[in-house]
Interface confidence: low
């Protein structure tokens, strides 16, 4: 139903959905703090621009009695219940910030008018791609997929002289929300990744993964998985691994690899870690002191959602344009705005662009070192370490199929 937006006459409200089911198990208090920090900054920016307006946030909580799994499994209904709550109250802000679960975002998107923007910290799945009024501030699965295809095809680097066309994907169903959708995208038969690879098999059991490590008849030397080093260790332990196996560990929202005192454990020597270029933000922020690295990214996305709204509000107000229009709702894309931790670029579809970093373990120093970076905005790989001290033979990544071409 048509809901009036509290979004005019110098007063602009942000509706923040505080859902019990969330992409990351983050206390709602921390997200509130992130939003409030963002509001402070936005107010300062608007004041600097000579715009004497009021910006506030309304936090919308679900009752938590029905939808209490805490993860994203029952989020579809929770999202719709919150929309119903907004509808009943006849009160909607200029923008909706909040749904982070792919299920809830997808359903809410289907069930709402396209007259206001939705900003999500999450919604990683392919089903949330290309939505006209949805902005995603954490790297979605599509971005990961494009990196992997780009990297697989690369064959002109000193440390990677073979194009790859095969892969195993380990996906056992216990993944976190981000990993679930990242791997889901790689598994999907219609996805870009599947289309570009000649061979791809999903390993669903621990034993399948463990057997592949030394299987002479394996169809690929490359295994993609998602999680942290501890997750890999639980699965792999200290088992022997064939010398030409390459494990790609996707761990985007974890900047612990970049900490000075971190040493890579021995079981990581056959592993390339894909993560995001770290920021050192939030170090002195009231809401961030007790956050883990992953939760820092999640809280930061909420904060950046507020800053993005402030950025767009400023532009529209300065141009004398109406905020409660489809033009405003569709404007949250193809732009760069001042995020909390640096410039944040959104692509043509409102998805955050970032620098992904591929790390390897140096056999000399036992430290994680940057092998290459990848700019999702231009879909381009930039080699960093031209002479990596790899565990692999000749300090080069092996071919993806054993016995094909010189090793």
């Amino acid at each position: 139903s048509q809901v009036s937006q509290n979004c005019h006459n110098g007063s602009y409200e942000i509706s923040v959905l505080m859902m019990g089911n969330s992409a990351f198990a983050e206390p709602l208090k921390n997200l509130e703090d992130a939003v409030n920090e963002g509001l402070e900054i936005v107010r300062g920016r608007l004041q600097n621009a000579g715009l004497n307006v009021t910006v506030n946030a309304t936090f919308m909580y679900s009752d938590g009695l029905i939808h209490n799994s805490g993860d994203c499994r029952s989020s579809t209904c929770e999202g719709l219940d919150l929309l119903r709550k907004i509808s009943n109250a006849q009160r909607m802000g200029c923008v909706l910030i909040g749904p982070s679960c792919t299920y809830s975002t997808f359903q809410m998107y289907l069930d709402t008018e396209l007259s206001y923007p939705m900003i999500s910290a999450g919604s990683f799945g392919l089903s949330c791609d290309y939505k006209e009024t949805l902005t995603r501030l954490m790297s979605p699965a599509r971005k990961l997929m494009y990196f992997l295809v780009n990297f697989w095809k690369t064959n002109d680097l000193p440390f990677k002289t073979y194009s790859w066309s095969t892969s195993y994907v380990y996906k056992n169903g216990t993944e976190t929300e981000d990993c679930f959708w990242y791997l889901n995208a790689l598994e999907a038969s219609v996805s870009y990744f599947s289309h570009e690879l000649g061979f791809k098999v999903v390993l669903r059991q621990d034993k399948e993964f463990q057997d592949i490590l030394m299987d002479h008849n394996r169809k690929s030397n490359v295994i993609i998985m998602c999680g942290g080093p501890e997750f890999l260790y639980k699965l792999k332990g200290d088992r022997a691994v064939a010398e030409d196996i390459v494990i790609i560990l996707v761990d985007l929202f974890n900047d612990q690899y970049f900490e000075d005192n971190v040493t890579a454990p021995d079981y990581m020597k056959n592993v390339l870690v894909l993560t995001l270029s770290p920021g050192n933000s939030l170090l002195n922020s009231s809401f961030s002191r007790n956050l883990s690295p992953t939760k820092r990214d999640f809280a930061l996305a909420y904060l950046n959602g507020i800053l993005l709204f402030g950025h767009m509000l400023k532009i529209f107000l300065e141009n004398g344009e109406n905020i409660t229009t489809p033009k405003f709702a569709h404007a949250f894309r193809n732009l760069t705005f001042e995020g909390y931790d640096g410039p944040v670029t959104l692509d043509d579809w409102g998805d955050v662009d970032s620098t992904m970093v591929l790390l390897y373990t140096s056999v000399d120093t036992k430290k994680y070192k940057v092998l290459l970076t990848y700019d999702t905005h231009v879909n381009k790989t930039y080699p960093v370490d031209m002479s990596p001290t790899f565990t692999w033979k000749n300090s080069k990544l092996p071919n993806d199929i054993t016995g094909r071409g010189p090793q």
Partner: antibody, heavy 117, light 108 residues
Framework: QVQLQESGPGLVKPSETLSLTCTVS????????WSWIRQPAGKGLEWIGR???????TFNPSLKSRVTISVDTSKNQFSLKLSSVTAADTAVYFC???????????WGQGTLVTVSS | EIVLTQSPGTLSLSPGERATLSCRAS???????LAWYQQKPGQAPRLLIY???SRATGIPDRFSGSGSGTDFTLTISRLEPEDFAVYYC?????????FGQGTRLEIK
């Protein structure tokens, strides 16, 4: 109109630490990046580094080991410290507002710092 | 780091003439993140152009910027007496941000 004003000692002894403060008026320090740039007499400009209110700093690698930049939002000020100075650090030091991806739209008038015993 | 080379080092022209200043980068400047500044003796630099071609607030339209990749140009269509100064280009597409060595525009 945003205005920036550098302040600090004009003379520093070799091996000591150069300390400058930039006071921002006419706008909040919370909303932008803030940079330090220097210019030796008769020479070109050299970007030293920047800070944002989150505490995020970025430095020129050539100076990184000697530079500290901090911010005090309550005073609307940000500061530069450059340790172990030599005569080569003698320059006019400017502070500037750094538009989030790097161009500098408001500058202080600059302050000359001479390194000499 | 990206090295910016400005040419010519000195440009001697008369008021009313057209000035063309060049800035060449040692490698491609990401997303055309290049700015031009004007500096007069004893003053701070003043932003003229950002993002290669966008004029800063309050800058007369006789100043224009163009270019992408590694080659950028600042054009002053009709020189006024107050335009004689030193001009610097700056790239901010990759860290560290770097400046060119400057072009001195002097009265002929």
């Amino acid at each position: 109109q945003v205005q920036l004003q550098e302040s600090g000692p004009g003379l520093v002894k070799p091996s000591e630490t150069l300390s400058l403060t930039c006071t921002v008026s006419g706008g909040s320090i919370r909303s932008y990046y803030w940079s330090w740039i220097r210019q030796p007499a008769g020479k070109g400009l050299e970007w030293i580094g920047r800070i944002y209110i989150s505490g995020r700093t970025t430095f020129n690698p050539s100076l990184k080991s000697r530079v500290t930049i901090s911010v005090d939002t309550s005073k609307n000020q940000f500061s530069l410290k450059l340790s172990s100075v030599t005569a080569a650090d003698t320059a006019v030091y400017f502070c500037a507002r750094d538009r989030y991806y790097g161009y500098l739209d408001y500058w202080g008038q600059g302050t000359l710092v001479t390194v000499s015993s | 780091e990206i090295v910016l080379t400005q040419s010519p080092g000195t440009l001697s022209l008369s008021p009313g003439e057209r000035a063309t200043l060049s800035c060449r980068a040692s490698q491609s400047v990401s997303r055309s993140y290049l700015a031009w500044y004007q500096q007069k003796p004893g003053q701070a630099p003043r932003l003229l152009i950002y993002d290669a071609s966008s004029r800063a607030t309050g800058i007369p339209d006789r100043f224009s910027g163009s270019g992408s990749g590694t080659d950028f140009t600042l054009t002053i269509s009709r020189l006024e007496p107050e335009d004689f100064a030193v001009y610097y280009c700056q790239q901010y597409g990759s860290s560290p941000s770097t400046f060119g060595q400057g072009t001195r525009l002097e009265i002929k």
